[in-house]
């Protein structure tokens, strides 16, 4: 057992059917001796007297708030919450595995550029009763600040017969520095607490690998003389790193067609302009990425070519 | 991802164009190590990030652009000292800084470049012979070298007397290759900072 | 104490269908995962699907993905495994087990598809 | 499909040293527990070890289970007559949890 925060305790349990549980010893806190009497939530029943309740705690039921009282008046609280661990491996009940980039990945996180602030974002199907926790370092033996802001309900999504909730979180770097060279992992730590249910997901990343630039701006088309062509052109957009000779993208420009099934015609270049051919009812579209560290392309930034 | 290959004007910063070559020598030479050695913790996740030339060079400090010396957090010590001469500042009027920055790149290069050599030479050993290291990635190195042109004592060739571990040997491997690639991509960023300055 | 009592095997045509059940007691049954495993006859143990506590979630092996499906009747305390379009490579003995350190494993039940 | 290695057979006499291996990788034993089963003819499997090295109660202290990087191992000190079985080991993948992984199995023999 561990406390969370101030009178909120968390019991791990091995979780199997039939398991033997775990004794929680539960102290009241307040200098009286005599005359304390234990109830758990709103019932009435009396499951102990004395400084002390020892419990045998072995599922949800046994969970919850625990009050002492005396003479009608309550001492304390303690809230217990329960963090199964099923055959060695602590549950995911309450986050939806994304399963991007890999497997069990609960937590996604992106960077707009290097100046250290980046939000993290998580899936769930639950509705109520749930609160989120959010910390984060650089390193985890001798961290380093991380200040991350509040959890909040970001999106709602119909799948399927479910309502899907997306979280997010935005944390910054207490001093990053852009141009430096990152050795240390992030570390993002999330508690999610469900009812009576406590789990933590963790994410550990570098800021080079969760690079997601915003799409180009101010995309513009100039057609060409006497020609199918047109001269495309964009700019940086506002949120990447400065200066941009140092922080450098590349581009992807693409050419499609109303139809999906058309051939895409794509150009890569470093410049913020491209020629291209421009056909009837097609849009042009481009995106950027990090010049030099292949992290994530940004999203597309279109015009139609009419 | 194949970077677009840049053709240099004549005019051009002369270390850009190498420096690009570096990047794409030492991503595909990571790419091949990752696939070739899939059974060893090669994943930027799993391996220990290590900088050879902490405490010895002062690449990023040195070479940060001029914009962000603004940033406290930028500024870390800049004690080091290099050799200030070069032929990649030929025909330009450079700072004191500048010849520190690329003296510094330059000593990155020759420390590599040893650690390559002798790492190279264990894994000629191992009866597997399951991974080398890239004679083009040891040559563009070489290049780039040269390009910077700067006076420097040779580093003598680590020998040792001792069996290697191939075990050991592979995942060093790994973890040079992941910070070189790093350190390569820094110094990218500041050729073309450079080049545009 | 726990136990696991399996029904529904039997002799089955290739490219028909069979439901497994596997009925819980001794325990809060919905409290728990549970997973289905098989075994060839001289064969290895192989792993077939898994559901989630609440049912919210199941995963399945490569080899039976879009032909069995896994549910659960937590009222009725039981868990059971759809089987369509049954192949000759699907003839093995069933368990249905708990998820756990400790596991309960049920006394299997034997399906064979042979025409 | 299988991704945890065992040896088909051992064999020894009663009172013999008896050790099954199961080898693996670092996306399964090197990040995960493991578990041996043994099974005797026509029954379901019976747990041995669990997290490792974990004795279930009424398993003889005889089984003992150990793991070290991505191998992990069973050993019987004293083997007797009615442990002849076939045994397994089972872990998990961190990619395809909660997926069982199991061990190609073992036959384990008691001579004489």
């Known amino acids: 057992i561990w406390e969370l925060k101030k009178d909120v305790y968390v019991v791990e349990l091995d979780w199997y059917p039939d398991a033997p549980g775990e004794m929680v010893v539960l102290t009241c806190d307040t200098p009286e001796e005599d005359g304390i009497t234990w109830t758990l939530d709103q019932s009435s029943e009396v499951l102990g007297s004395g400084k002390t309740l020892t419990i045998q705690v072995k599922e949800f039921g046994d969970a919850g708030q625990y009050t002492c009282h005396k003479g009608g008046e309550v001492l304390s609280h303690s809230l217990l919450l329960l963090h199964k661990k099923e055959d060695g491996i602590w549950s995911t009940d309450i986050l939806k595995d994304q399963k991007e980039p890999k497997n069990k990945t609960f937590l996604r996180c992106e960077a707009k550029n290097y100046s250290g602030r980046f939000t993290c974002w998580w899936l769930t199907t639950i509705s109520t009763d749930l609160t989120f926790s959010v910390k984060s370092s650089r390193g985890s033996s001798d961290p380093q600040g991380v200040t991350c802001g509040a959890a909040t309900l970001s999106a709602e999504r119909v799948r399927g017969d479910n309502k899907e909730y997306e979280y997010s979180v935005e944390c910054q770097e207490d001093s990053a520095c852009p141009a430096a060279e990152e050795s240390l992992p992030i570390e993002v730590m999330v508690d999610a607490v469900h009812k009576l249910k406590y789990e933590n997901y963790t994410s550990s990343f570098f800021i080079r690998d969760i690079i997601k630039p915003d799409p180009p701006k101010n995309l513009q088309l100039k057609p060409l003389k006497n020609s199918r062509q047109v001269e495309v052109s964009w700019e940086y957009p506002d949120t990447w790193s400065t200066p941009h000779s140092y922080f450098s993208l590349t581009f992807c420009v693409q050419v499609q067609g109303k139809s999906k099934r058309e051939k895409k015609d794509r150009v890569f270049t470093d410049k913020t302009s491209a020629t291209v051919i421009c056909r009837k009812n097609a849009s042009i579209s481009v995106r950027a990425q990090d010049r030099y560290y292949s992290s994530s392309w940004s999203e597309w930034a279109s015009v139609p070519c009419s | 991802r194949n970077l677009p290959v840049a053709t240099p004007d004549p005019g051009m910063f002369p270390c850009l164009h190498h420096s690009q070559n570096l990047l794409r020598a030492v991503s595909n030479m990571l790419q091949k190590a990752r696939q070739t050695l899939e059974f060893y913790p090669c994943t930027s996740e799993e391996i220990d990030h290590e900088d050879i030339t902490k405490d010895k060079t002062s690449t990023v400090e040195a070479c940060l652009p001029l914009e962000l010396t603004k940033n406290e957090s930028c500024l870390n010590s800049r004690e080091t000292s290099f050799i200030t001469n070069g032929s990649c500042l030929a025909s330009r009027k450079t700072s004191f800084m500048m010849a520190l920055c690329l003296s510094s790149i330059y000593e990155d290069l020759k420390m590599y470049q040893v650690e390559f050599k002798t790492m190279n030479a264990k894994l000629l050993m191992d009866p597997k012979r399951q991974i080398f290291l890239d004679q083009n990635m040891l040559a563009v190195i070489d290049e780039l070298m040269q390009a910077l042109n700067f006076n420097s004592e040779t580093v003598p060739q680590k020998s040792s007397l001792e069996e290697p571990d191939f075990y050991k040997t592979k995942i060093k491997l790994c973890i040079l290759l992941h910070a070189f690639r790093i350190r390569a991509v820094t110094i990218d960023r500041v050729m073309s900072y450079l080049n545009a300055s | 104490q726990v136990q696991l009592v399996q029904s529904g095997g039997g002799v089955v045509q290739p490219g028909r269908s069979l439901r497994l059940s596997c009925a819980a007691s001794?325990?809060?049954?919905?409290?728990?995962?549970m997973h289905w495993v098989r075994q060839a006859p001289g064969k290895g143990l192989e792993w077939v699907a898994f559901?989630?506590?609440?049912?919210?979630?199941?995963y399945y092996a490569d080899s039976v993905k879009g032909r069995f499906t896994i549910s659960r009747d937590n009222s009725k305390n039981t868990l059971y495994l759809q089987m369509k379009s049954l192949r000759a490579e699907d003839t093995a003995v069933y368990y249905c087990?708990?998820?756990?350190?400790?596991?309960?494993w049920g006394q299997g039940t034997m399906v064979t598809v042979s025409s | 499909s299988y991704v945890l290695t065992q040896p088909p057979s051992v064999s020894g006499t009663p009172g013999q040293r008896v050790t099954i291996s199961c080898s693996g990788g670092?996306?399964?034993?090197?990040?995960?527990?493991v578990k041996w089963y043994q099974q005797l003819p026509g029954t379901a499997p019976k747990l041995l070890i669990y997290?490792?090295?974990q004795r279930p109660s009424g398993v003889p202290d005889r089984f003992s289970g150990s793991k070290s990087g991505t191998s992990a191992s069973l050993a019987i000190t004293g083997v007797q007559a009615e442990d002849e079985a076939d045994y397994y080991c089972?872990?998990?993948?961190?990619?395809?949890?909660?997926?069982?992984?199991f061990g190609t199995g073992t036959k384990v023999t008691v001579l004489g």
């Open positions: 001794g325990f809060t049954f919905s409290s728990y995962g």
């Open positions: 997290g490792n090295d």
């Open positions: 089972q872990s998990y993948d961190r990619g395809t949890h909660p997926a069982l992984l």
């Open positions: 559901i989630r506590y609440d049912g919210s979630n199941k």
């Open positions: 087990k708990t998820h756990g350190s400790h596991d309960n």
């Open positions: 670092r996306s399964n034993i090197g990040r995960n527990t």
